[in-house]
Interface confidence: low
């Protein structure tokens, strides 16, 4: 996850160890049936478990294990590089029976001048170079091949694209004598897609370009370009869709204005304005045409770029995103929150909710957190009783049925899920808040009290009477 955080989500459980599962013995022909389960209703969890168990039982005599890991492939075209000139790459786990491909763009902030890129290279080198990347990665959350952890798309071909361009996946400039660093985020995506066509992507039915944080913004910036690329290369039948997690930022007024000295404190508009020039950043063509030259920075903000996109995009965004609060200079440390800051935070949630009003496919819980889709517990959070995997399944169905002219939402299968309660953690399924310094789980009631909410407001959704809450707090708990 990105940047400096004051409150952290509950520690992620380690992914389960890879299971010993039967697979076809080497050299045997494998007959694959590209089934499409998009429109399956009912209990998806048990259905998927049954399907997987059936698939496994087809090869009872094999000794080979099914590997759950994604394997590293550095780009064959070594001119498409990370910041330091090392080749970019991707991690892949193929699922030969599936015509679904999930390409995930990693996040990790950005740097926008020589000084803060040098500092980033010293402290976060794996986000600027492929030299020390591990040979394999375990797929978690939406990248997991376990139906228990990923009831949505466990059977898809999984691709994790590490972020090593520091440019919000927008850059198109190579390393030279003049440029100490290469910024090739947009080109890396294009090259990965090109190489994957030779590894089975050519037979895909659906390509879902997903990403978290800077990767989520990267989805908004690149999804139409990927669709256009596939069309030009002769694959117009591949449906390209986007899933942008925690990358829908507001160019709002900071709580306290600070000069643009580093990545974290620089106002997002100013950071992106400077970044675009430094990276030779590219934005979606239809969005670029809406703004004057020099104003392309606008296209990095979801609510401005989204209406110009042609591909369907599902937006996932915490209403109180930690990265948003960080760039707005909100640091919830030490002293209890003043009234002005409490109102600022509440207003942020309100503004974000407003920007999602016309985004038909969206999932926005009223939580203070950052990123969700590759967390092992991504299935836990609900909005109005619907989990994110369920909402994504409903989205798939709505797109599957969209050729039937009907624009009415599917009964009992919602895709627009935005919390309406107005303060952080008023949704009972929010991830636990943790204190950055002690790592201890914070009592949500205490956390909200610290943020200046009145007793009744805080006590109710936590399942406490105000008197009980007072007692708990006065007992020093």
């Amino acid at each position: 996850s990105e940047g400096r955080k004051t409150w952290r989500r509950r520690g992620q459980q380690p992914p389960p160890p890879p299971r010993t599962e039967a697979a076809p013995a080497a050299g045997q022909p494998v007959e694959s049936f590209p089934l499409d389960f998009t429109a399956v209703e009912g209990n998806m969890d048990s259905f998927m478990a049954q399907v997987k168990s059936l698939a496994q039982s087809l090869y009872p005599c094999s000794a080979q294990q099914l590997n759950e890991d994604l394997r590293l492939h550095l780009l064959l075209n070594t001119s498409v590089t990370c910041n330091d000139g090392s080749p970019a790459g991707y991690y892949l786990k193929e699922s030969r029976g599936s015509r679904r491909w999930l390409l995930f763009l990693e996040g990790g902030w950005y740097c926008f001048n020589r000084e803060n890129c040098d500092s980033r290279y010293d402290t976060m080198r794996r986000l600027m170079s492929s030299r020390d990347w591990p040979r394999t990665r375990t797929g978690t959350g939406i990248l997991s091949s376990q139906p228990e952890e990923n009831p949505y798309w466990w059977n898809a071909n999984m691709v994790f694209i590490p972020y090593c361009s520091s440019d919000v996946w927008s850059g198109a400039s190579s390393k030279s004598e003049k440029n100490e660093y290469a910024f090739m985020g947009a080109l890396i995506i294009q090259e990965v897609v090109r190489e994957l066509l030779g590894r089975g992507l050519s037979g895909a039915k659906v390509l879902l370009l997903a990403g978290s944080a800077a990767g989520g913004t990267g989805v908004l910036l690149n999804v139409d370009r990927v669709a256009e690329q596939l069309e030009k290369l002769g694959y117009p039948a591949i449906q390209v869709r986007g899933l942008a997690d925690s990358g829908w930022f507001l160019d709002n007024k900071q709580y306290r204005h600070t000069d643009c000295v580093d990545t974290i404190t620089c106002a997002p508009t100013e950071a992106i304005r400077r970044g675009i020039r430094y990276w030779n950043g590219v934005v979606p063509e239809r969005c670029r045409r809406q703004f004057q030259e020099g104003e392309e920075w606008n296209c990095f903000f979801g609510y401005k770029v989204y209406p110009t996109l042609r591909c369907p995009v599902f937006v996932v965004q915490w209403l109180f995103d930690e990265a948003q609060l960080t760039v707005d200079n909100v640091h919830l440390t030490g002293q209890p929150v003043q009234e002005g800051l409490r109102l600022y935070i509440q207003n942020l949630g309100r503004e974000l909710r407003h920007t999602l009003k016309d985004v038909p496919a969206s999932f926005a819980p009223a939580c203070l957190s950052h990123e969700i889709i590759i967390r092992s517990h991504w299935t836990d959070v609900q909005v109005k009783g619907t989990s994110l995997p369920r909402a994504l399944h409903c989205w798939d169905r709505s797109l599957h049925d969209s050729h039937k002219a009907s624009k009415t939402p599917l009964k009992g299968c919602p895709v627009h899920l935005v919390d309406s309660c107005p303060w952080p953690h008023c949704n009972p399924s929010c991830p636990t808040v943790r204190d950055q310094f002690t790592g201890q789980e914070m009592n949500v009631a205490q956390f909200l009290m610290h943020m200046g909410f009145d007793m009744q407001t805080v006590a109710q959704p936590q399942g406490l009477e105000p008197s009980e809450l007072l007692g708990m707090l006065s007992n020093g708990s």
Epitope: N427, Q440, E441, G463
Partner: antibody
Framework: EVQLVESGGDLVKPGGSLKLSCAAS????????MHWLRQAPEKGLEWVAY????????SYANTMKGRFTISRDNAKKTLSLQMTSLRSEDTAIYYC????????????WGTGTTVTVSS | DIVLTQSPASLVVSLGQRATISCRAS??????????MHWYQQKPGQPPKLLIY???NLESGVPARFSGSGSGTDFTLNIHPVEEGDATTYYC?????????FGSGTKLEIK
């Protein structure tokens, strides 16, 4: 496999003391609030006590306040319930249960340990 | 404390038919669009097992024959179609305020 196993149940005289333990495995114990609940013979379920993940919040049923103490050791993945001044009405199967952080329900239960208070 | 009144205390249902169990709270257990009511099944000699959480959400691994509904003070657990193995006791529980409390249980028999 996610598991909770209670131990320490015994036959004890009224006014006596007993310490119950609950060993957790298969999940990150330190992430979860934990509860003790009980069920008297042929009766319904009754909540006993709660402890938050970092032991910052402790809460007890009214009839057990002052007599029972809930504690945990996250490093050892154990939950404890120290019971004193036991009464015959404390006779029950005692269960430890994990509180799901999505709204206060009990998503994992132990198999239970039997406490009998009788002279 | 919030009192949960479960009804009926016992219920006889034919195999394959629908079983409906009610739970009424002495005050609302809903807040901000969420209902803090949960349902458990308990077989003799075993601990309770979570079936439904937050009023209507099916716990992972629980058959879709089980469903929950309701908000405010009135909640329902439905089992349809009923199977032999469903013959046991069911409890509702709220987590709206401390202490959490349980209903007195409903014993389901299959004929």
């Amino acid at each position: 496999e996610v598991q909770l196993v209670e131990s320490g149940g015994d036959l004890v005289k009224p006014g006596g003391s007993l310490k119950l333990s609950c060993a957790a495995s298969g999940f990150t114990f330190s992430d979860y609030g934990m509860h003790w609940l009980r069920q008297a013979p042929e009766k319904g379920l009754e909540w006993v006590a709660y402890i938050s993940s970092g032991s910052t919040t402790l809460s007890y049923a009214n009839t057990m306040k002052g007599r029972f103490t809930i504690s945990r050791d996250n490093a050892k993945k154990t939950l404890s319930l120290q019971m004193t001044s036991l009464r015959s009405e404390d006779t029950a199967i005692y269960y430890c249960a994990r509180k799901n952080y999505n709204g206060g329900y009990f998503d994992v239960w132990g198999t239970g340990t039997t406490v009998t208070v009788s002279s | 404390d919030i009192v949960l009144t479960q009804s009926p205390a016992s219920l006889v249902v034919s195999l394959g038919q629908r079983a409906t169990i009610s739970c009424r709270a002495s005050k609302s257990v809903s807040e901000s669009g969420y209902s803090y009511m949960h349902w458990y099944q308990q077989k003799p000699g075993q601990p309770p097992k979570l079936l439904i959480y937050l009023a209507s959400n099916l716990e992972s691994g629980v058959p879709a024959r089980f469903s929950g509904s309701g908000s405010g003070t009135d909640f329902t657990l439905n089992i349809h179609p009923v199977e032999e193995g469903d013959a046991t006791t069911y409890y509702c529980q709220h987590s709206r305020v401390l202490p959490p409390t349980f209903g007195s249980g409903t014993k389901l028999e299959i004929k």
